[in-house]
Interface confidence: medium
């Protein structure tokens, strides 16, 4: 039985050219996290953090994605095209898969305030 819940940074905004941290947290379960996948809305993989093997950043994103903090992901040099949904998929044993959603809005404005709060989607 899957008892866990994913908390995410929810809806966040950041300015063009800046960076943003995508963060998910799995709670309320004793399941072992074996892998975390970070994906874009089109299912393309940005990065994998495997418990045995560490981080792998996919080649298309190597220049603009940094692993961490923790199991999170840092997107750098943001462009307007980065606006959209991001998903963290927690592969756990024995529970199975937990999935969290984050919506990132990249703003042109230089006064765009980086807003992030943890929430349960």
């Amino acid at each position: 039985m899957m008892t866990g819940t994913i908390e995410t940074t929810g809806n966040i905004s950041a300015k063009k050219g800046g960076s943003v941290i995508l963060q998910c947290h799995l709670s309320s379960t004793m399941a072992q996290v074996t892998q975390v996948n970070w994906e874009q809305h089109d299912h393309s993989l940005l990065a994998i953090r495997n418990a045995e093997l560490g981080w792998h950043i996919y080649p298309a994103f190597k220049d603009r994605v940094a692993p961490g903090p923790g199991l999170g992901l840092t997107l750098q040099s943001l462009t307007m095209n980065d606006t959209g949904e991001y998903f963290c998929t927690y592969h756990t044993y024995p529970d199975g898969t937990y999935r969290g959603r984050i919506f990132l809005e990249v703003l042109e404005s230089s006064v765009a305030e980086h807003s992030a709060r943890f929430q349960i989607p």
């Epitope: 892998q35 996948n37 994998i48 045995e52 093997l53 998929t89 592969h91 756990t92 024995p94 999935r99």
Partner: antibody, heavy 125, light 107 residues
């Protein structure tokens, strides 16, 4: 290129323990960034994942078999093993050892890309 | 666990024709899906991983598509050696699960 070879008795009595070994050649388990797995196929049926192990000894089992399964790895012999206890006729199958992610630099969960040829195990008195 | 359902169970096709095999996951597996080919008396062979990437040495007539819960394996022009059973498998969470298989037979 890694190659796999299963070995073990072809006949096991009901209630006994099935024991199989998979020998890996062409590369060292101790340095491999992949998962070692056991998969079975009952006669005329589909494939069923039994469980997987990483070189560190971390194991992952199919919940339907977990209470009866033990998978272990011996890096010094370049082998990994399957033990399935309290077998019944329903455990009669071709048992395959396989490697998940052997040919991928993009590590993580990918696919079973290398398979042994399989060994038939019959449970009968 | 994620249940993988394949259809049809049997597909009768003439050599040279196109074959389309379907696989459905009971919940999203993103692009974490593999396809295998198995011939009688042989171990399965990996054809496609990450839903659409051909494994090394697999001919271009094999192609995979789909993401989320719906996936397709297409064999553009069936050769005699392609008549076999095809399995899909999700590579996303534990436990690993396979579909029941589609047998592609000669019409």
């Amino acid at each position: 290129q890694l190659q796999l070879q299963e070995s073990g008795p072809g006949l096991v009595k009901p209630s006994e323990t099935l024991s199989l070994t998979c020998t890996v050649s062409g590369g060292s388990i101790s340095s491999g960034s992949y998962y070692l797995a056991w998969i079975r196929q009952p006669p005329g049926k589909g494939l069923e994942w039994i469980g997987s192990i990483f070189r560190s000894g971390s194991t992952y089992y199919n919940p339907s078999l977990e209470s009866r399964v033990t998978i272990s790895v011996d890096t010094s012999k370049n082998q990994f093993s399957l033990k399935l206890s309290s077998v019944t006729a329903a455990d009669t199958a071709v048992y395959y050892c396989a490697i998940e992610g052997a040919n991928f630099k993009d590590f993580g969960y990918v696919a079973f890309d290398i398979w042994g040829q399989g060994t038939t195990v019959t449970v009968s008195s | 666990e994620i249940v993988m359902t394949q259809s049809p169970a049997t597909l009768s096709v003439s050599p040279g024709e196109r074959a389309t095999l379907s696989c459905r996951a009971s919940k999203s597996v993103s692009s974490n899906l593999a396809w295998y080919q198995q011939k009688p008396g042989q171990a399965p062979r990996l054809l496609i991983y990450f839903a659409s990437t051909r494994a090394t040495g697999i001919p271009a007539r094999f192609s995979g598509s789909g993401s989320g819960t719906e996936f397709t394996l297409t064999i553009s022009s069936l050769q005699s050696e392609d008549f076999a059973v095809y399995y899909c498998q999700q590579t996303s969470p534990w436990p690993r699960t396979f579909g029941g298989g589609t047998k592609v037979e000669i019409k």
